[in-house]
Interface confidence: medium
């Protein structure tokens, strides 16, 4: 069977039926490229005008305008707002009613796409892998990231959110349509990773999204997380504005200058520094989620009421932390170079700057507690990995998934560790699962590309989409279409109950309260820490500022600082970073 | 990239009191302890007190008890020793010192100021 | 107090030679640094945690010994480590050793 053409509000789209096998039977019809929106620079998108005839939606449409990996070019296209569907048909009747699974890419609010990475036009979400296997309808779809995606003065002149607001768009669109492709617009599942697993989280939590949303998985990432939410907009505002000659004294002024000018300009004007410098990377992280009032209107943290009838898995890597950690502190992975005390110190004094000194000596104390017993490099180095792990990962799922259990009402809730260790051949053999190491095997490439990966792989893959796909069939992992290899129980406020995923799952995979002690001191004993308040401290920016952001700035509860200029010798910034 | 920057020479008279500066700078000032330690001529090194430059607490050694003071201004990444009552043993160089990480040896010296004590 | 003790007060010895400092605690202490002091300039870091070197720091110094004995050595004397030692401890409220002169023999 296959769908054919299908109408939708914007007008008739046609995708590719493939069969998945040369003796006919089952196939996958596959639309690519279908427009949910369009967007004016630094505008709120609004919904397509539609057209006339047939879209032929065969071919992914190019990623949102954003910089290359090296950061001294653009690609990509304004024109962007597009999303791909995939469908499973069986051999006879055409597919009605299944659960729809719609994926939200990570890559720091800054880069990606709804196809994902390309090799040899094997695209890394292409979601043909989990709408056969679980039988449901996939969506991906692109959203606008960097400046153009997050930009905002911190007021309505540009409040920001671009990038969510086009999400949304997304979602709703997703709601309005699906049922012409066979999918239940009442039972939509959005998934996602790092920066697409913090929108998840901020998706479910804002109240556009009322009725739109059923269920919910954020793999690394979420809401609270420390790198979610710019709380100084517009010191990043007027750092780009100044790059690209834009007034910065008024923000309508500036505003209305930053939306005439080049988009390729307004993406280059921001890079993200890649080398180490004096705080941790993730506070460079500056076109981010903002809370404007209105698309997020409160501190997440307050706004879980919203998800109290969303069912919602969330999980982590267990060394989520490492590529972090690989730009705060190199030498963790190389095998010659030495981790330092001091240098772990600085990394946890950048983290916890909110708490002074305090925060940071009481925090490098209950890290470092291991190190007398055993101060092996591989030790010290696995320490900066779990540290970066839990403050940027695990601290903010837990509290995360506590505060959803804690609001449920028919909602249930999940919690995962994904510990499949990297096969990355460059990395130490200590080395565990990096960030977005789960991404291959939540979209089936073991499968995909089978000579690629070993028998244990496909076994994971196997399980995360059996876990996943019948999740978003009933709310529970366990029931579906799908055989798992061992229940996963929901997650409890008592035991902290999360599966450990790796390549043998068994009852014994069931695990509790996830480094409970970390857990205790973050959310106890450095909680209840004094906040340093109105602190600066002087740093000397970088030489060229082509090279690398300037210093981040504070929550701007605190003072505001000026942004360095490109002459500028010393920036002045206030010590609190909106963590 | 740490530097801290102490001000210049002071020559005092006995009974007087002298106030030293330290600009820190190139870290994030309130993450680390600043320590005074001052060296009279020809002598070895004494331990005075210590600021915590995130909420102004201070600790000071028995000997300086009374007579002396720490303070930091986080709007200017500068910690200030002042000690009172100068008698000519006063006479000598003074160093801030920071902390290399926690609480740890000291990691980074300012260049010294020298107060002299002289009727 | 903790009191710190040093020995030898002074040695004099040539570029090539082997030396080592040693630093007594009056009581059992959790760690030990040792700074390194060159006329009219402020003591630099050499050794913290009884034994580890900071970066930029030469290996032919290395340290030794916990509890209250502690030792510095220097492997192979080069002409730029003619300068005073310190030991130096932050168990309770931090002191240090009286130093030690080293001097071209």
């Known amino acids: 069977a296959k769908l054919g053409a299908v109408y939708t509000e914007g007008g008739f789209v046609e995708g590719v039926n493939k069969k998945l096998s040369l003796l006919g039977g089952d196939s996958v019809d596959i639309f690519k490229g279908i427009p949910f929106a369009t967007a004016k620079t630094l505008e709120n998108p609004q919904r397509h005008p539609g057209w006339q005839g047939t879209l032929k939606a065969t071919n992914f449409k190019k990623r949102c305008l954003q910089a290359t990996i090296t950061q001294d070019n653009t690609y990509g296209q304004e024109d962007c707002l597009y999303l791909n569907i995939w469908v499973p048909q069986g051999r006879k009747q055409v597919s009605h009613n299944l659960p729809v699974m719609v994926w939200i890419y990570g890559g720091a609010f800054l880069m990606g796409s709804g196809q994902g990475a390309n090799f040899l036009k094997n695209y890394l979400y292409d979601g043909e892998e989990i709408a056969t296997r679980g039988n449901v309808i996939v969506v991906t779809f692109n959203y606008r990231v960097g400046p153009l995606g997050f930009l905002s003065t911190g007021d309505a002149n540009l409040p920001g959110n671009f990038g969510l607001r086009d999400q949304h768009m997304a979602i709703a669109w997703v709601k309005r349509n699906i049922a012409a492709f066979g999918g239940d617009p009442d039972n939509i599942t959005i998934f996602g990773e790092s920066a697409g697993a913090a929108s998840v989280s901020l998706q479910t939590l804002s109240p556009y999204n009322k009725g739109l949303i059923r269920r919910a998985i954020s793999q690394s990432g979420m809401a609270l997380s420390p790198w979610a939410i710019q709380k100084n907009p517009l010191f990043w505002a007027k750092t780009i504005a100044k790059k690209v000659g834009c007034p910065t004294e008024d923000t309508g002024k500036m505003a209305a200058c930053l939306k005439i000018t080049d988009p390729r300009a307004l993406t280059l004007a921001y890079k993200l520094p890649v080398k180490k410098q004096e705080y941790p990377v993730v506070h460079y992280l500056a076109f981010i989620p903002v809370i404007d009032g209105d698309f997020i209107p409160d501190d997440p943290i307050n706004l879980y009421n919203n998800t109290a009838d969303i069912d919602y898995i969330a999980g982590i890597n267990n060394m989520d932390g490492h590529l972090f950690a690989t730009i705060d502190v190199p030498a963790v992975d190389k095998t010659k170079q030495t981790v330092t005390e001091e240098d772990f110190y600085r990394l946890v004094s950048g983290h916890t700057v909110a708490k002074g000194l305090k925060g940071a000596q009481a925090t490098f104390d209950i890290y470092t507690e291991s190190w007398a017993q055993d101060p092996s490099q591989e030790n010290m180095k696995k320490t900066v990995v779990a540290f970066e792990t839990d403050v940027l990962f695990l601290i903010p799922t837990e509290i995360a998934l506590a505060q959803h259990k804690a609001h449920a009402k028919s909602a249930k809730t999940y919690s995962y560790l994904f510990s499949h260790p990297s096969r990355m051949p460059i990395y130490p053999k200590w080395m565990g699962a990096d960030h977005a190491d789960d991404l291959q095997y939540v979209f089936g490439k073991p499968f995909a590309t089978p000579l690629g990966y070993r028998p244990q792989d496909r076994a994971v893959s196997k399980a995360m989409i059996a876990y996943w796909t019948n999740f978003a069939r009933s709310g529970d992992p366990n029931m579906g279409n799908s055989p798992v290899p061992t229940h996963w129980y929901p997650y409890t406020l008592e035991n902290g109950n999360y599966l450990d995923i790796t390549k043998t799952i068994t009852s014994a995979s069931m695990k509790e309260h996830l480094r409970e002690k970390f857990l205790k001191f973050w959310a106890v004993t450095f909680e209840v820490l004094p906040t340093v308040t109105g602190d600066q401290d002087t740093l000397t920016p970088p030489e060229d500022d082509s090279e690398v952001a300037p210093d981040p700035p504070s929550d701007d509860s605190q003072v505001v600082p000026v942004p360095p200029t490109d002459d500028s010798v010393e920036a002045q910034m206030p010590a609190t970073i909106g963590f | 990239q740490v530097q801290l920057v102490q001000s210049g020479a002071e020559v005092k008279k006995p009974g007087a009191s002298v106030k030293v500066s330290c600009k820190a700078s190139?870290?994030?000032?309130?993450?680390?302890?600043m320590h005074w330690v001052r060296q009279a001529p020809g002598q070895g090194l004494e331990w005075m007190g210590v600021i915590n430059p995130s909420d102004g607490a201070t600790s000071y050694a028995q000997k300086f008890q009374g007579r002396v003071t720490m303070t930091r201004d986080t709007s200017t990444s500068t910690v200030y020793m002042e000690l009172s009552s100068l008698r000519s043993e006063d006479t000598a160089v003074y160093y801030c010192?920071?902390?290399?990480?926690?609480?740890?040896?000291?990691?980074?010296w300012g260049q010294g100021t020298l107060v002299t004590v002289s009727s | 107090d903790i009191q710190m003790t040093q020995s030898p007060s002074s040695l004099s010895a040539s570029v090539g030679d082997r030396v080592t400092i040693t630093c007594s605690a009056s009581?059992?202490?959790?760690?030990l640094h040792w700074y390194q002091q060159k006329p009219g300039k402020a003591p630099k870091l050499l050794i913290y945690?009884?034994?580890k070197l900071p970066s930029g720091v030469p290996s032919r110094f290395s340290g030794s010994g916990s509890g209250t004995d502690f030792t510095l050595t220097i492997s192979s004397l080069q002409p730029e480590d003619f300068a005073t030692y310190y030991c130096h401890q932050r168990s309770s409220y931090p002191t240090f050793g009286q130093g030690t002169k080293l001097e071209i023999k």
């Open positions: 190139g870290y994030t000032f309130t993450s680390y302890n």
């Open positions: 945690a009884a034994s």
């Open positions: 009581q059992s202490i959790s760690y």
């Open positions: 010192a920071r902390d290399y990480y926690g609480s740890s040896p000291l990691g980074y």
